[in-house]
Amino acid sequence: IWELKKDVYVVELDWYPDAPGEMVVLTCDTPEEDGITWTLDQSSEVLGSGKTLTIQVKEFGDAGQYTCHKGGEVLSHSLLLLHKKEDGIWSTDILKDQKEPKNKTFLRCEAKNYSGRFTCWWLTTISTDLTFSVKSSRGSSDPQGVTCGAATLSAERVRGDNKEYEYSVECQEDSACPAAEESLPIEVMVDAVHKLKYENYTSSFFIRDIIKPDPPKNLQLKPLKNSRQVEVSWEYPDTWSTPHSYFSLTFCVQVQGKSKREKKDRVFTDKTSATVICRKNASISVRAQDRYYSSSWSEWASVPCS
Amino acid sequence: VPGGSSPAWTQCQQLSQKLCTLAWSAHPLVGHMDLREEGDEETTNDVPHIQCGDGCDPQGLRDNSQFCLQRIHQGLIFYEKLLGSDIFTGEPSLLPDSPVGQLHASLLGLSQLLQPEGHHWETQQIPSLSPSQPWQRLLLRFKILRSLQAFVAVAARVFAHGAATLSP
């Protein structure tokens, strides 16, 4: 058993049929010595008396809010949550496996630049009695500070018969060094509590591996005289690290016809302009990627050829 | 470059960008079998990293690029030695046309651009290389190349910025 926060405790249980469970001793936080009784949740049934209560925790029915009283007055509470371990593996019932970039990916994180700011998100089908708390650091043995905000519900989607809820959190490394080569990964830890079930999820990454620039901005076309060619120009996204001579991007320019089956013409360039042939009813799209490290491409910025 | 002269920024920029491309094309080379698991043992902890105080940020380069260039040179030599070690020359053998050969030569080429024959910076950080067990090599290659990708990305940014802002 360990303390998650004040008066909230997590009992770690091996979860299998007829498991013996864990013996837990609760102590009433009071100077009083006698006349103390214990109850669980809203029930008035007295579970025991005395300053301590020993219980065998085997299942969710044994978890909940234990309260000690004296003469009708509440002295203190202890909330017991369960953390299940099945076949040596901690349960992951609360969050959905996003399966990207690999199986057992529950947390996904992205950064728009090298400033040390990043966003993580996760999915669940649970809509009520759900709380999250997020902690982060750089490195684990001698951790350096990363400050995370509160997790918020950021999107709701309908997936077949189910509703899916996306939560996200923003974090900022306290002393970020954008130009350095990271040697210790960022660790993100999410505590999830659904009713009386506790689970924790972790992700470990380097900022460089989760970089995804915003799409190029100010995408413009300039027709070239007496030609089907156009000059496409764009700018670095505002959110990208500066100076651009140091934090350089590379770009992919694509000409795509209306039909998905039409052949796509692609050009790669380090410049912020390119000359392409603009076909009727086609569109021109540009996306960006770090020039020197193959992290994710940005989403496309697009303009119609006409 | 040792002694404070300026490097051939544009040449260094071109070669470091080539190094980035090679490091990424070499990476999927995990050899005769899939990398079944990445493993947790810290096999590449002692590689030289370009750290915050090494002066490789735009301001540090403007103030005095020598600290940063020395750090980059040190790293290039270190990785060049790793790529020539039995981790890469031993079994499972790399194919004769593997990009690792080119990567190795380019690391040497860039380090020589930074330190021409006869000029010397102080002692290098050299990998302490006991023979690597064959079964460890795929994982070691994977980790070394991942680490090298990060190192050459910073080096390429330094030379791109230098070529754009510090070239005579």
Epitope: - | G84, D86, T89, E91, P96, G101, P131, W135
Partner: antibody, heavy 115, light 107 residues
Framework: EVQLQQSGPELVKPGASVKMSCKAS????????MHWVKQKPGQGLEWIGY????????NYNEKFKGKATLTSDKSSSTAYMELSSLTSEDSAVYYC????????WGQGTLVTVSA | DIVMTQSPATLSVTPGDRVSLSCRAS??????LHWYQQKSHESPRLLIK???QSISGIPSRFSGSGSGSDFTLSINSVEPEDVGVYYC?????????FGGGTKLEIK
Amino acid sequence: EVQLQQSGPELVKPGASVKMSCKASGYTFTRYLMHWVKQKPGQGLEWIGYINPYNDGTNYNEKFKGKATLTSDKSSSTAYMELSSLTSEDSAVYYCSLNWDYAYWGQGTLVTVSA
Amino acid sequence: DIVMTQSPATLSVTPGDRVSLSCRASQSISDYLHWYQQKSHESPRLLIKYASQSISGIPSRFSGSGSGSDFTLSINSVEPEDVGVYYCQNGHSFPYTFGGGTKLEIK
């Protein structure tokens, strides 16, 4: 075409030393290890050790430490093995071989130790 | 050291037979196992690498299987020129060790 050409047979006296060579061609000499293997007449194969011609790093079978010394010469793409304090137990054919997963072996050098 | 044990020591076969040669490692070597053929007065010749990977120029009748500590070299239709000694080799860890060999004879 990859070839490993070994030096000719040696007849040596007990207590003496012998140095044999393995000249490599058809590939980049410093890109792969060179292994050495012993085979006594009518018997099996025993790994002696390898040299990495790139950095002259060596790795020996404990059994052959002090007996075999592996060296190489990049300029001539040649690997060498010296055997010291020879006894009749050292009479054998000695092979050089490229990385195991490459199918290239030298033709062998026969060493006969006899008074 | 990893001990490689081959069986049988000798195998007498008729041309056209399918034969299996066994090799056992004293501990798991994953698939880091190589098979060699050595004919009289010749250098060893690599037949199979990494337990089951074929080698260019080696007839397709030779195949390998196994992983961990038990391995098999199969010759699916023996030819008279297949006579010789077959060795398996631990390519997993130092010191590299060879099996004692299986001598293949033609009846």
